[in-house]
Interface confidence: low
């Protein structure tokens, strides 16, 4: 239609200036469409440049959505994070507070002798929380070691122990139960406590960081190429107030982000797996009631060896012999006082079923996420028809789309009229995070029948940092306790020396 | 990058008090332990004290336990090396460092970063 | 204090390694200072790690009770005073050794 060949371009000329570019690429009026590599050849008012142009827009415009999709959803998911892991951390410094504020009246110097060893076991507990590769049933065992040979050492200054009596003391502990359940009981439930707070936040951790990652996989050039049929080329074509057909862009979307949807079933997992593993946070097993009490598991545990005492001290003797007498040392100690113990039960605060009903609604929420994405973005960035079936942007004018909308997933995009897909190829950074909800979920299972998991090694880029490798954010700011190489001497944090003056201020 | 900016050096009087602060940035203030050290003119460092991540904990050298006082300010991302009762021995410079760790329990041996330093001359 | 040799000379490419002993939390820490006052830079914290800007010439190991800073093909850049900190549980302090001045 010769009349057609001279209808202006005004309103691509406003549209594309609206995005910045030069107005002189611009035709007056159509031109013939032949130099089109993308949109339908037809008469035109898009020159090859701004066909180029527009592409590049429309890619970097669709990424933009993607990121502000995704970043959503992990400012979501490190707000959880920051509230749980400040609970869960709140809990254990309210704990060694109340120790510090309690101990030294309750137990006097069998305590504050010994204030270091009750520090240093905190430390550890803060590092077995926060991922680090420490077995806590070891360094439960080491300090409960440690702490019987002091104390005993303590209970009879009048006696020269010697280190080969000290480990005779050390092997006959076991049977000789010298703090009475407390050891084991502590250790039950801390272990368990312990493992699903952590499991839990790093499964916070571990959802945000996929997010991310995934944020930032580039769309390939077909996805361009679809993309920009879709959302610019009505307007190259003369028909810019064709809005693009509802399933036309979820196919466009579906093919685009086709290795994204292929995260769904193992994110649904993830998300199962943690909400399942906050059954845990309550009871007295749980997070709440274990982590804020471990004070006074230890105080239980004084009181044990002090009413044990003289039984531990005849079965000592008869197992490893009879000590010599330190002719400087003072005489027997007298029974020390019995500390007082708070109940063992913390009441709940409210704030951990706050916390835990909040995060299930936000994670039950999110579940669909990565399947729903083409979808959301349809309809809340490319400003979808709601004109009838057959007056929206079908990709080549104004008319119905008839192709059937895809399924979810790489596989089902074998046949995508709109993005060509190469199915035999996934993206190996998405199928790098569906590897690591995998592993997130199985620590989360594990977790949830109560044994301990190795939070080493998940990192998945291989550089030996960063928030794959089972810290919290850029809580990495931790290490292995500092062992010294003698059992006899205290565990060497560069930190031994806080007077108890100062452990009693401390809050 | 990180940088840790100490201010609050110059001509002290003996017997007076001293106010250092370090004002961090470019890491997670909150996440780590923070450190002073200080170097007398022509002599070596000498670990002068630190202060816990969350700030509740404390501990100080020999030299200047009972007159030191370390704190920090999370949300201001700073921390205050406060010296009482000065001697003429307190004259050095006085770096503030940051841990590569962040719970009770770091040292020395875990500075992974120093400020420029700033003088302090007490006479 | 912790012990180090007071001077190390080396010739460029040639490898230097200085010791720290005296401490007994086996914990090392190694400090650059190329003039006395001036600014001071951490080359390695916890026995063994390296800050991300430091050359890997530099290396830290602990065996026993002694530390060892390695710098591997040392450079005259690398002319400066190393200090090493670590801890005294005897006096529950953070200590340092008085410095050794390596000369290239």
């Known amino acids: 239609d010769p009349a057609s060949k001279s209808r202006s371009c005004g309103e691509v000329r406003q549209i594309y200036g609206a995005k910045g570019f030069s107005l002189s690429d611009v035709p007056q009026a159509e031109i013939s469409g032949e130099h089109l590599r993308i949109c339908p050849q037809g008469y035109t008012c898009c020159t090859s440049e701004m066909e180029e142009n527009l592409a590049n827009r429309s890619h970097a415009e669709l990424e933009t959505a993607l990121r502000d999709s995704s970043r959503v959803l992990q400012a979501m998911l490190a707000t959880q994070l920051r509230s749980f892991d400040d609970h869960f951390q709140h809990l254990l410094n309210d704990s060694e507070r109340t120790l510090q504020a309690t101990f030294p009246g309750a137990f006097g110097e069998l305590y504050t002798q010994n204030a270091r060893a009750f520090r240093d076991l905190y430390s550890e507990l803060r590092l077995y929380y926060r991922g680090a590769n420490l077995h806590l049933e070891e360094t439960l065992a080491e300090f409960w070691a440690r702490l019987l040979e002091r104390l005993f050492k303590q209970l009879h200054p009048q006696l020269l122990l010697p280190d080969d009596y000290l480990d005779c003391l050390g092997k006959q502990a076991e049977a000789l139960r010298p703090f009475g359940e407390a050891p084991r009981e502590l250790r039950l439930r801390a272990t368990r406590a312990f493992v699903a707070a952590r499991s839990f936040v790093q499964g916070l951790g571990v959802a945000s960081d996929v997010v991310r990652k995934v944020a930032q996989v580039p769309l390939g050039p077909e996805c361009s190429r679809a993309v920009m049929k879709l959302v610019y080329c009505a307007h190259c074509l003369g028909v810019p107030g064709a809005r693009p057909c509802p399933d036309y862009c979820r196919n466009v979307l579906k093919g685009c982000l086709a290795n994204q949807a292929d995260l769904d079933a193992e994110w649904r997992n993830l998300l199962d797996s943690m909400v399942l593993i906050t059954d845990k946070f309550w009871g007295t097993s749980g997070v709440e009631s274990v982590i804020g009490s471990v004070h006074t598991w230890l105080a239980e545990a004084i009181n044990a060896l002090q009413d044990n005492r003289d039984t531990l001290t005849a079965k000592v003797i008869q197992g490893c012999g009879n000590p010599k007498v330190n002719p400087q040392g003072p005489g027997p100690e007298e029974k020390r006082r019995r500390g007082k113990l708070a109940p063992r039960e913390r009441p709940p605060s409210g704030t951990l079923e706050k916390l835990v009903s909040e995060a299930k609604a936000q994670l039950r929420d999110v579940q669909d996420f990565w399947i729903s994405l083409p979808g959301t973005l349809c309809s809340e960035k490319m400003a979808l028809s709601t004109a009838s079936d057959d007056r929206c942007w079908n990709g080549m004018a104004r008319g119905r789309y008839l192709p059937e909308v895809m399924g979810d997933g790489l596989a089902n995009q074998i046949n995508n009229p709109e993005v060509e897909v190469d199915i035999t190829k996934p993206d190996m950074t998405i199928r790098q995070q569906i590897m690591q909800l995998k592993i997130m979920t199985n620590r989360l299972r594990s977790a949830y029948n109560g044994n301990d998991v190795d939070f080493q090694d998940a990192s998945d880029d291989g550089s030996g940092s960063g928030s794959g490798d089972g810290c919290l954010d850029d809580l990495c700011s931790r290490k292995v306790s500092r062992k010294s190489s003698s059992s006899r001497t205290p565990l060497t944090h560069a930190l031994p020396g806080l007077s108890e003056q100062e452990g009693q201020k401390t809050s | 990058a990180v940088t840790l900016d100490e201010s609050g050096g110059g001509l002290q009087t003996p017997g007076r008090a001293l106010s250092l602060v370090c004002k961090a940035s470019?890491?997670?203030?909150?996440?780590?332990?923070m450190l002073w050290v200080r170097q007398a003119p022509g002599k070596g460092l000498e670990w002068v004290g630190v202060i816990s991540s969350s700030g509740s904990s404390t501990n100080y050298g020999a030299a200047v336990k009972g007159r030191a006082t370390i704190s920090r300010d999370n949300g201001q991302n700073t921390v205050r090396l406060q010296l009482n009762n000065l001697r003429a021995e307190d004259t050095a410079t006085y770096y503030c460092?940051?841990?590569?760790?962040?719970?009770?329990?770091?040292?020395?041996?875990?500075?992974?970063?120093w400020g420029l330093g700033t003088e302090v001359i007490v006479s | 204090a912790l012990t180090q040799p007071s001077s190390v000379s080396a010739n460029p490419g040639e490898t230097v390694k200085i010791t720290c002993s005296g401490g007994s939390g086996n914990n090392y820490g190694w400090y650059q200072q190329k003039s006395p006052g001036s600014a001071l830079v951490t080359v390695i914290?916890?026995?063994?790690k390296r800050p991300t800007d430091i050359p890997s010439r530099f290396s830290g190991s602990t065996s026993g009770s002694t530390g060892t800073l390695t710098i591997t093909g040392v450079q005259a850049e690398d002319e400066a005073v190393y200090f090493c900190?670590?801890?005294?549980?005897?006096?529950?302090?953070?200590?340092f050794g008085a410095g050794t001045t390596l000369t290239v």
């Open positions: 460092a940051k841990s590569a760790y962040g719970y009770y329990g770091s040292g020395v041996s875990d500075i992974d970063a």
């Open positions: 470019g890491f997670t203030f909150s996440n780590y332990d």
């Open positions: 914290y916890d026995n063994n």
């Open positions: 900190g670590g801890y005294d549980s005897s006096t529950y302090a953070d200590i």
